[in-house]
């Protein structure tokens, strides 16, 4: 079961002082942080029990497994059911303690009943302040049951459940009709889901017969102990004062567990501390009691005396819970209550006994749960004691459960039980996750879901290159930590898995699911420079660079362009996609902007160094294109070009330039300048016969304009070849006229 | 579903005896204490008697007592109010009823019973 | 055992809000807070509207509650409906486990 004990202090006198306490001895209890520990939670439950609101109730974590619930201002605050929640996964646990008015109506004589499956409960509540009219019993908030005031027996109702089952467990509460809830006495009912005595799917095995009140769990079999005792069945009482599993908690306050309510996991339920009693857990037993609640009686033998903590303290000589076996009788020696194994291994059991006749190795004998008895294959004979050694065989998980030692000479007999668990090395049911990757490193996060059980004590990550048939490199790692696998080669497949370990020998669990995980590439490392730049107009830029000259192959797969317009804040960037580029034309600028440029080279998605910046300014947008653009034939080396000026021009054209390209040839175009804006007419001369032309143009007044149409035309016939085109302007009525 | 179901109601001459019986359904019977509630034609509901769930405590308003007996089997989901001495006075729709906390939170449709010569 | 006090008819139109009292002795009213009242139309079986003095099952609307005050119990209809025209029985207990009803009041929504 867990380890989880809820502490109600019961100073009733001021609710002010009244607190609850939870409290875990589970391993990374309440860390909440992590995968491996959930955290405790401790609160009021109104589901059924609703009581007036309140001020909220402060909760207050001290360390890691200790919770506390205080700010309680008035009696009617404590009234109700109160529950901690502890343990990871499986194992979460629920612990509840009911909480009754010390002035109500009516108060329960037991407020925990525990009973069997089958079995009879009898809730008794006794009458502290009588009414005249009936007693409404409810079940979990709903009605249950009407009694007849006149039907109280020795100033009790009762309530008598026949044939109890799983589902009639809850909270139960007895109260008078027209009475404040407050007023009612609440019980809790526990129903096992075996019978006595059983447990387990199907309850056909058998508890371990456990001490001191203690509680078979119908689901493992485990002893669950009243506070102040442990051991695989309860059969060890712990120091006055401390509780726990282990006796590892220690009350607070000077006057040691007086006072307190203690509630441990079902079935056990709730109970005033070893050596103490009453409705306030403030009664010290009487004489010839002892334990949780006083319940045990001593009925020591042999000159025994009674504690109230712990039961008979026996005189030398004599042993055994009433002090009732002589040291003479055989008896078992240091047997640690409970064992834990991984499956599959083959442990050495240990099992020492003494008494007179003194046992020998085969007096000693090891019962497993299926009856099945191993003799000792070897014995160990010191003075005081004989220690048999039994070698197991393979465990397997039906090997689980309780085991016993006995020991058998002419003087007795005495055995001691003890609960062997059985653990299923974990096994990851995931593949480790990729964080992050480098050209030689990848980091992975190891922590994954599993099967079987933990705690996990080390995670190891095996890792090699993607079919590859080379040994597994390995690496342990810590289970809460991520793992960076190093040195290794770029642009690489690896293929991943974890392995998992538990404590103890044969912990380490089978290697979980492969996963592929790539390097990246080698980063670039050669930085590229620009070698210039120049507009193409008012939102067109070429630029140009170049790279270091290196032996060997280049590394990159292209270039990244950068421009950044500082003013608006805004970034572009242009993917050249071949490393044997270095020229590249950047289209849809923002005219008038001043732009800072930069170029790198990328491999995969790793950028190289940037070359040193370039600061362009861009022109400003020019005008609208001229309109009506036509060529006209004069001679086989001239061709008029006319047209109209631009509409709703931003200010005086500066110039005009003219686009001159022979159709279908690949060669450059040419520009030449009108340098007279006042012109709609000009002649290109020089120009080759028979051949067909393209012209544009466009005007520029601070920055060049939009292009024109594009118009054809071919020069005349049989010329002969010309040294170029050259331009001659004059205004189009000049030219009208001639 | 919870419900009620009267039964037994008749015609009678004055001192005869007649037996009503309610079926109840849908809830575990033998947990709650039942009660007879009557209303005369015109008139308004009168308490008659109740039993609690043992069936050991039984309790009859005036005008019944001596005469009606409230009994029930728990066995038989079934409440009965033996009537006996009938008179004129006890003419009316009988209802049995279920008492939760309190209030008669369910009620039957009703048997009616007439005290006539 | 004498019945409970109630008036014979209360009225009111349709949102209004009317209150019907029921009143009682020292001995069944005053002495507990185990008043319940009842809702009766024509031909059907009662229903209860309110328990324990100012309980409301479920089910039953919040424009119906219940309050007391010394020997007199009351009902209050609050947004006064068509369908809340009915018959209502007030019912006390009276001590050693018996109860009365009141005379029952008719409710007209004008």
């Known amino acids: 079961a867990v380890d989880l004990t809820l502490l109600a202090n019961l100073r009733l006198t001021d609710p002010q002082r009244f607190f609850l306490t939870c409290v875990s001895g589970e391993a990374g209890a309440g860390r909440g942080s992590d995968a491996w520990g959930p955290p405790l939670l401790l609160e009021k439950d109104d589901r059924i029990v609703r009581t007036p609101p309140g001020p909220p109730l402060r909760l207050a974590r001290n360390g890691s497994h200790q919770v506390t619930l205080r700010g309680f201002s008035k009696p009617s605050d404590l009234v109700g059911v109160f529950s901690c929640v502890g343990g990871a996964g499986a194992r979460r646990t629920r612990v509840i303690y009911v909480h009754n008015s010390p002035g109500a109506h009516l108060l329960p004589d037991k407020v925990t009943h525990t009973v069997n499956k089958g079995d009879t409960a009898v809730l008794s509540a006794r009458v502290h302040k009588e009414k005249q009219t009936d007693v409404i019993w409810k079940s979990n908030g709903s009605y249950f049951y009407t009694l007849d005031w006149h039907e109280a027996q020795d100033g009790r109702f009762l309530l008598q459940l026949p044939n109890v089952q799983p589902p009639s467990s809850g909270i139960y509460s007895a109260t008078y009709l027209e009475a404040s809830p407050l007023g009612s006495a609440f019980f809790r009912l526990i129903v096992r889901g075996c019978g006595a005595g059983r447990w387990g799917p199907g309850c056909t095995k058998e508890c371990p017969g456990c001490l001191h009140g203690g509680v078979c769990h119908d689901h493992d079999g485990e002893c669950v102990c009243p506070p102040g005792f442990t051991g695989t069945r309860c059969e060890q009482a712990c120091r006055e004062g401390r509780f726990g599993q282990s006796c590892q908690e220690q009350c607070p306050g000077i006057s040691g567990c007086r006072g307190l309510t203690f509630c441990l996991p079902d079935p056990y339920g709730c109970s005033c501390g070893s050596g103490w009693r009453g409705s306030q857990c403030q009664e010290a037993c009487a004489p010839g009691h002892f334990g949780a609640d006083c319940r045990l009686q001593c009925q020591c033998q042999n000159g025994g005396t009674c504690d109230r903590f712990s039961g008979c303290v026996c005189p030398s000589g004599w042993h055994g819970v009433h002090c009732e076996k002589s040291d003479r009788i055989p008896q078992i020696l240091n047997m640690a209550s409970e064992l834990e194994f991984n499956l599959e291994t083959m442990p050495r059991i240990n099992c020492a006994a003494a008494g007179n006749p003194f046992p020998v190795r085969g007096s000693i004998e090891l019962r497993k749960p299926d009856g099945t008895v191993l003799l000792s294959t070897k014995a160990i004979v010191e003075p005081e004691k004989t220690t048999a050694e039994f070698e197991v065989p393979r465990l397997v998980l039906a090997d689980s459960g309780f085991w016993e030692c006995r020991v058998s000479t002419s003087g007795g007999q005495d055995s001691r039980r003890f609960k062997v668990n059985v653990k299923v090395p974990p096994v990851p049911l995931a593949a480790p996750r990729l964080l992050t990757k480098q050209s030689r490193q990848l980091v992975v996060s190891p922590l994954v879901s599993f099967s079987g059980d933990g705690p996990i004590s080390t995670v190891r990550l095996h890792y090699r290159p993607q079919d590859s048939t080379m040994d597994w490199s390995t690496i342990v790692v810590d289970p809460s930590e991520n793992v960076t696998l190093m040195n290794l080669r770029p642009k690489t497949g690896y293929s991943v898995r974890v392995q998992l370990s538990r404590p103890g020998e044969g912990g380490e669990g089978a290697w979980g699911p492969p996963t592929l995980m790539t390097t990246d590439c080698p980063e670039p490392l050669l930085q590229p420079w620009l070698e210039g730049w120049h507009v193409e107009g008012t939102d067109r830029l070429r630029v140009s660079w170049s790279l270091p000259l290196v032996p060997g192959p280049l590394v990159g797969d292209g270039f990244l362009l950068r421009l950044w317009d500082g003013t608006r804040g805004q970034e572009r960037r242009e993917n050249v996609s071949s490393p044997q580029a270095r020229t590249a034309l950047l289209t849809g600028l923002t005219p008038g902007t001043h732009y800072q440029l930069d170029v790198q080279l990328y491999h995969c998605t790793l950028l190289g160094p940037a070359s040193p910046p370039a600061h362009v300014l861009l022109p400003p947008s020019g005008p609208p294109a001229p309109r009506h653009l036509h060529a006209q034939a004069l001679s086989d080396s001239e061709i008029q070009l006319t047209w109209k000026h631009p509409e709703a021009l931003p200010g005086p054209i500066s110039k005009y330039v003219v686009e001159v390209q022979v159709a279908g040839g690949a060669g450059d175009p040419l520009w030449i300048d009108v340098d007279r804006p006042e012109e709609t007419s000009t002649i290109i001369r020089g120009l080759n016969a028979s051949t067909r032309y393209l012209f544009r143009m466009r005007a520029s007044i601070q920055g060049l304009g939009d292009w024109s149409n594009t118009v054809e035309e071919s020069t005349l016939g049989n010329g002969l070849q010309a040294e170029g085109p050259v331009q001659e302007s004059r205004a189009a009525e000049e030219g009208l006229d001639q | 579903e919870v419900q009620l179901l009267e039964s037994g109601g008749g015609l009678v001459q004055p001192g005869g005896s007649l037996r009503l019986s309610c079926a109840a359904s849908?809830?575990?019977?033998?947990?709650?204490?039942m009660t007879w509630v009557r209303q005369a034609p015109g008139k308004g509901l009168e308490w008659v008697s109740s039993?609690?769930?043992?069936?050991?405590?039984?309790y009859y308003a005036d005008s019944v007592k001596g005469r009606f007996t409230i009994s029930r089997d728990n066995s038989k989901n079934t409440l009965y109010l033996q009537m006996n001495s009938l008179r004129a006075e006890d003419t009316a729709m009988y209802y049995c009823?279920?008492?939760?906390?309190?209030?008669?939170?369910?009620w039957g449709q009703g048997t009616l019973v007439t005290v006539s010569s | 055992q004498s019945e409970l006090t109630q008036p014979a008819s209360v009225s009111g139109s349709p949102g209004q809000s009317i209150t019907i009292s029921c009143t009682g002795t020292s001995s069944d009213v005053g002495s507990y807070n185990l008043v319940s009242w009842y809702q009766q139309h024509p031909g059907k079986a009662p229903k209860l509207m309110i328990y324990?003095?100012?309980k409301r099952p479920s089910g039953v609307s919040n424009r119906f509650s219940g309050s007391k005050s010394g020997n007199t119990a009351s009902l209050t209809i609050s947004g006064l409906q068509a369908e809340d025209e009915a018959d209502y029985y007030c019912?006390?207990?009276?001590?050693?486990?018996?109860?009365?009803f009141g005379t029952g009041t008719k409710v007209t929504v004008l």
């Open positions: 039993i609690y769930p043992s069936g050991g405590w039984t």
């Open positions: 324990e003095g100012s």
């Open positions: 009823a279920r008492q939760e906390d309190g209030g008669y939170g369910t």
């Open positions: 019912c006390s207990y009276a001590g050693s486990s018996t109860y009365v």
């Open positions: 849908g809830f575990t019977f033998s947990n709650y204490k």
